[in-house]
C-alpha cells in the first residue's frame, strides 16, 4: 500500500531506563524490539507509557498511518473494542471527544494521532500490564485496530519477547523491503536477550527530573500517509482486566454514536468550533444505517443515553457539519 518505509529517528528511552547494560547497549535492542513488535502493523501504532512523575498514571498514544480521512478513533482497555474490551474514549473529528473514567484527558495530537491520559488512583485505575487498544476508522478506506501495553514494571522491556496483539490486518506491502533487516534485528535481539538473562535485570528507576519520554514525530497528513512503517515504542502485551464496568463507566453511553458517519470531512489544523448537530451543513450527506460504528460506543447495559460533547479546540476540525443520520 505504501512505497517506502519512513522510520522516524528513535530517541533513547528515559535515563531512568538505563540499567546494568548501560545507555548505549540498551538503545539498539530497544529499537529492534520495537521493530519486531510493529513489523506486521503498518497502519496503526500504539505507545503506552507510565508517567515518571505519577507511577499510577498512564499515557496512551496512538497514530494512524494509512490513507483516507480519519472519521473515528476509539481507545479501549482490557482487549480489543467489541471483543471484551471496555471503551475509555471516543474521538470524533466533528462531534468532539467523549471519555470515561479513568480517562483524564483525551485529545488529538495531530490530524492522525491522539493521546489519552489515564488517572492512576481509585478502583478503576489500570494495572501495569493492562492492554490498551486503539481503533481508527478511516473513510472510505476501512478500520484498523492495534493494541499495546507497558513492559513489565521490573524491566524496561527486555525481559521477555513481545507478544503483541494487533487486531490490525493491514497489507504488508511497504514493509517487505525491510523484512530482511527486521529478521536480522530480531535474531540479534534474541541473542542479546539471552546474554541479558545472565545479568542482573535493570530496575525501573523513574526520574522525576528526567526529560519527557520520546514522542513520535508529529506526522502531517501527507507524511502520515507516506509512512510505510512507523516505529512507536516497544510494547509487551499481557492481560489485566480493568475494573468492573460499573466502576469504570458511571456515565451514559454515547447515544450520539448510535448511527455514525463513516467519514470526517477535511480537517485543517487549528482551533475551530466543531459542528455538533446531527443536521448537515449542506444537504449532500448520506445516511448511515445499521449504526456503522455503534460498536465504538458500546457501553455497559446499565448506562443510559445523553451526552454533552466538549470538543477539543486543539483537535482537527471539520469542513462541514456531520453527516445526517437516519
Amino acid at each position: 500500500m505504501r512505497t517506502e518505509a519512513q522510520v522516524p529517528a528513535l530517541q533513547p528511552p528515559e535515563p531512568g531506563l538505563e540499567g546494568a547494560m548501560g545507555h548505549r547497549t540498551l538503545v539498539l535492542p530497544w529499537v529492534l524490539l520495537t521493530l519486531c513488535v510493529t513489523a506486521g502493523t503498518p497502519e496503526v501504532w500504539v505507545q503506552v507509557r507510565m508517567e515518571a512523575t505519577e507511577l499510577s498514571s498512564f499515557t496512551i498514544r496512538c497514530g494512524f498511518l494509512g490513507s483516507g480521512s480519519i472519521s473515528l478513533v476509539t481507545v479501549s482497555w482490557g482487549g480489543p473494542n467489541g471483543a471484551g474490551g471496555t471503551t475509555l474514549a471516543v474521538l470524533h473529528p466533528e462531534r468532539g471527544i467523549r471519555q470515561w473514567a479513568p480517562a483524564r484527558q483525551a485529545r488529538w495530537e495531530t490530524q492522525s494521532s491522539i493521546s489519552l491520559i489515564l488517572e492512576g488512583s481509585g478502583a478503576s485505575s489500570p494495572c501495569a500490564n493492562t492492554t490498551f487498544c486503539c481503533k481508527f476508522a478511516s473513510f472510505p478506506e476501512g478500520s484498523w485496530e492495534a493494541c499495546g501495553s507497558l513492559p513489565p514494571s521490573s524491566d524496561p522491556g527486555l525481559s521477555a519477547p513481545p507478544t503483541p496483539a494487533p487486531i490490525l490486518r493491514a497489507d504488508l506491502a511497504g514493509i517487505l523491503g525491510v523484512s530482511g533487516v527486521l529478521l536480522f534485528g530480531c535474531v540479534y535481539l534474541l541473542h542479546l536477550l539471552r546474554r541479558h538473562k545472565h545479568r542482573p535485570a535493570p530496575r525501573l528507576q523513574p526520574s522525576r527530573t528526567s526529560p519527557q519520554a520520546p514522542r513520535a514525530r508529529a506526522w502531517a497528513p501527507s507524511q502520515a500517509s507516506q509512512a510505510a512503517l512507523h516505529v512507536p515504542y516497544a510494547t509487551i502485551n499481557t492481560s489485566c482486566r480493568p475494573a468492573t464496568l460499573d466502576t469504570a463507566h458511571p456515565h451514559g453511553g454515547p447515544s450520539w454514536w448510535a448511527s455514525l458517519p463513516t467519514h470526517a470531512a477535511h480537517r485543517p489544523q487549528g482551533p475551530a468550533a466543531w459542528a455538533s448537530t446531527p443536521i448537515p451543513a449542506r444537504g449532500s450527506f448520506v445516511s448511515v444505517e445499521n449504526g456503522l460504528y455503534a460498536q465504538a460506543g458500546e457501553r455497559p447495559p446499565h448506562t443510559g443515553p445523553g451526552l454533552t460533547l466538549f470538543p477539543d479546540p486543539r483537535g482537527p476540525r471539520a469542513m462541514e457539519g456531520p453527516l445526517g443520520v437516519r
Epitope: G142, S143, A170, Q226, H263, G291
Partner: antibody, heavy 113, light 107 residues
Framework: EVQLQQSGPVLVKPGASVKMSCKAS????????INWVKQRHGKSLEWIGL????????NYNQKFKDKATLTVDKSSTTAYMEFNSLTSDDSSVYYC??????WGQGTTLTVSS | DIQMTQSPSSLSASLGERVSLTCRAS??????LNWLQQEPDGTIKRLIY???SLDSGVPKRFSGSRSGSDYSLTISSLESEDFVDYYC?????????FGGGTKLEIK
Amino acid sequence: EVQLQQSGPVLVKPGASVKMSCKASGNTFNGYYINWVKQRHGKSLEWIGLIDPSNGGTNYNQKFKDKATLTVDKSSTTAYMEFNSLTSDDSSVYYCAGGTVYWGQGTTLTVSS
Amino acid sequence: DIQMTQSPSSLSASLGERVSLTCRASQDIGNNLNWLQQEPDGTIKRLIYATSSLDSGVPKRFSGSRSGSDYSLTISSLESEDFVDYYCLQYASSPPTFGGGTKLEIK
C-alpha cells in the same frame, strides 16, 4: 493483499432486480470497507456506497439509497449489491473496491427488454 | 456534492514526454484526493493517495501535488503503458466524487 473477484455479466429486463457479488480472497477483508462504484460506458465513475464487513454497517450516496442495497456475508467473505427497479439508466459496469486501493474487475449490467 | 473538474479530458503526448493532469475541487478538500488509473480492459489501480503519496508498486515517474484547489498528477517521462485513462477522487466530503477523467493518448 486483498483480491476482489466480482460476479459475471448479467442481462436483465427493465423493472427486475439483480444481485451482484464481490468475493474477497484469502478469507479476509483485511479491515477494508467495501465500496461500490458505477461507471456508465466510457464515462466517469460514481460512488454508490460502502459497507463495513465487520458489522454490516452501510453508508449510501443519497442518489442510490433507494436503488441499491449493500450486504455482506462474513462467513464467505463476500459482499453483495442488489439493484432494484432496473431501467436502461442502470446499464453500466459496477466495481467493488476494498477502500480505494483494491479493485474488483467489474460486473457489466445490461438492462434491456 | 463536491464537484471535481478534471482537465484536459484528453491529451495526446509522446513517449518520454512529461505531462500533467489537473483536477480542481469546487470547495476545500485538503489533501483528501486520490488518483486512479484505468486500463482499457476496465482494470482500476490506485496510483496516488492523500494528494502526493505513491502507492506500493507504482513507478516513481508518477507524482502528485497540490496548489490551492488545483491538484495535479504528473508523469515525468511517459512510457507506453501510461496511455490509459486517469481519474481523480476526493473523499473529504461524502459522497466521494470523481473527476470526469483524462484519456491519455499516444501522439
